[in-house]
Interface confidence: medium
């Protein structure tokens, strides 16, 4: 993908409500294009704020106070609704709403919408066509939940409209904006260090690669040309300044690390892979 | 700068029919819902009908439903409202509004006069 | 339906004057309430929506408060401009519905 972000892509916001008690409440809400977050919202003075220069897209200044109106209304009713009917959908203090909703554009064109609620992390509630529908598993609970969500067909409409209408045509905007940003090639820098013994007479060797941009990225321990199927991946993890870090790890016999290298592929290198040599590492690590 | 303006008013016998037409520009047409409003002589004002920015969506009040059908071609920036059986009380100027993401209607036309009378 | 109730129907107040127009539901609208302003023979103008956001381009002697079922606007200090009738209308559910009006008249 040209953008350097993984088809299909999403922009969703998620919206993550903690009820201590019933007057004590923490809400935190945040924007992303698929990984990447672009936005967040300031709690205290009602407003959204731009993570990245390109974060507003092609909206117009109009268009974005109409949102940050609409978030606004929207997290002051959430919490009196959830507050008022947590007795009655037996929701028991302390708990955790998480919702998230979006859109996705699959090679360009616009590919669905999304729309989910979970309660204390489990799958309860979902925004279908143009009403809330429980999760099978979720229960009565869900079923009464999604009554009280299906009041207001009003409410319900708007929410349609966000999801069918708004998102993908903000969607559409940041990519363009972004372009710059999201096209960019980092090239990765990679290291090689001693990870904790597993056990007498064998060795942990690591390969660090980090600093790279876009996520996707090929890393492996290698004896000549031939992979090593022991290599494990970890996470992809974010950095600061915007670009990802790796690493990968490999459990040998002391005997056997001489002749193991680490080849990392990514698309700055331009089919020049990186690739270091064990036997050429420092043994301080 | 956002810009509505309503024709297609006039005088009508009661039972007839009018179509208003809203031309729209300035703003991402297709991307909202519209309304038509309307306002009685010497009265308040009274939502009619609305329509969501795909066209996929339409509401009307009460006191039309039925009679009155709201439609738009994007292709074209424009609103309708076809109005079909009219009656004494549809006497009034017709507004088309710009609904804000449904919260408001924050641009409206200058409005239109339709006169149902025999 | 929604019924809004505004209050008073009618007022007269000098320039410089504040002045407060009230707005009630027949339900609960949380803050989907929003002000407009009409003069004679034009169209209405929002002045505020969701309560308490300032529509761009209204001056800042207009403000709106309120949610649930009681809604207030004020002018801080009235001007020539502002003699005209004031509606408020929710939009917390379909259909839409206005107050019958305020109307604001010369001392």
């Known amino acids: 993908n040209a953008d350097g972000l993984k088809e299909p892509l999403s922009f969703h916001v998620t919206w993550i409500a903690s009820f201590y008690n019933h007057s004590w409440k923490q809400n935190l809400v945040s924007g992303w294009l698929s990984d990447l977050q672009t936005h967040t919202w300031d709690s205290n003075s009602s407003t959204i704020v731009f993570l990245c220069p390109w974060s507003r897209g092609n909206f117009s200044n109009e268009e974005w106070k109409e949102l940050e109106t609409l978030f606004r209304i929207r997290t002051i009713r959430s919490f009196e609704g959830i507050r008022r009917y947590a007795h009655e959908l037996q929701f028991e203090y302390p708990f955790e709403i998480q919702v998230t909703g979006g859109c996705e554009l699959h090679s360009g064109k616009v590919s669905g919408s999304f729309l989910q609620l979970a309660y204390q992390g489990s799958d309860f509630v979902s925004f279908q066509n143009n009403s809330w529908l429980p999760y099978p598993v979720a229960g009565n609970m869900a079923k009464h939940f999604c009554k009280v969500l299906n009041q207001n067909q009003h409410e319900n409409d708007i929410t349609h409209n966000l999801l069918s209408d708004t998102c993908p045509r903000f969607i559409l905007g940041l990519l363009d904006a972004g372009k710059a940003h999201l096209q960019r090639q980092v090239k990765p820098e990679a290291w090689l260090s001693h990870g904790p013994s597993p056990g007498p007479g064998h060795l942990q060797l690591v390969c660090h690669v980090s600093g790279f941009y876009p996520k996707p990225v090929w890393v492996m321990w290698m004896r000549g040309e031939q992979e090593q199927q022991g290599t494990q991946r970890g996470d992809i993890l974010p950095s600061a300044d915007g670009t990802w870090y790796l690493r990968a790890t490999l459990e040998v016999a002391a005997g056997e690390a001489a002749d193991l290298s680490c080849r990392v592929k990514h698309s700055s290198l331009e089919g020049q892979d990186i690739v270091l040599y064990w036997e050429h590492h420092s043994s301080v690590g | 700068e956002v810009q509505l303006v309503e024709s297609g008013g006039g005088l009508v016998q009661p039972g007839g029919s009018l179509r208003l037409s809203c031309a729209a520009s300035?703003?991402?047409?297709?991307?909202?819902?519209m309304s038509w409003v309307r306002q009685a002589p010497g009265k308040g004002l009274e939502w009619v009908s609305a329509?969501?920015?795909?066209?996929?969506?339409?509401y009307y009040a009460d006191s039309v439903k039925g009679r009155f059908t709201i439609s738009r071609d994007n292709s074209k920036n424009t609103l309708y409202l076809q109005m079909n059986s009219l009656r004494a009380e549809d006497t009034a100027v017709y507004y088309c509004?710009?609904?804000?993401?449904?919260?408001?209607?924050?641009?409206w036309g200058q409005g239109t006069l339709v006169t149902v009378s025999s | 339906d929604i019924q809004m109730t505004q209050s008073p129907s009618s007022l007269s107040a000098s320039v410089g004057d504040r002045v407060t127009i009230t707005c009630r539901a027949s339900?609960?609208?949380?803050?989907?309430l929003n002000w407009y302003q009409q003069k004679p023979g034009k169209a209405p103008k929002l002045l505020i929506y969701?309560?308490?956001s300032l529509q761009s381009g209204v001056p800042s002697r207009f403000s709106g408060s309120g949610s649930g079922t009681d809604f207030t606007l004020t002018i801080s200090s009235l001007q020539p401009e502002d003699f005209a009738t004031y509606y408020c209308?929710?939009?917390?559910?379909?259909?839409?519905?206005f107050g019958q009006g305020t109307k604001v008249e010369i001392k």
């Open positions: 509004a710009k609904d804000a993401l449904w919260l408001a209607f924050d641009y």
């Open positions: 300035g703003f991402t047409f297709s991307s909202y819902a």
């Open positions: 329509i969501s920015g795909s066209g996929g969506s339409t």
């Open positions: 339900q609960s609208i949380s803050s989907y």
């Open positions: 969701a309560a308490s």
């Open positions: 209308q929710q939009s917390y559910s379909t259909p839409p519905t």
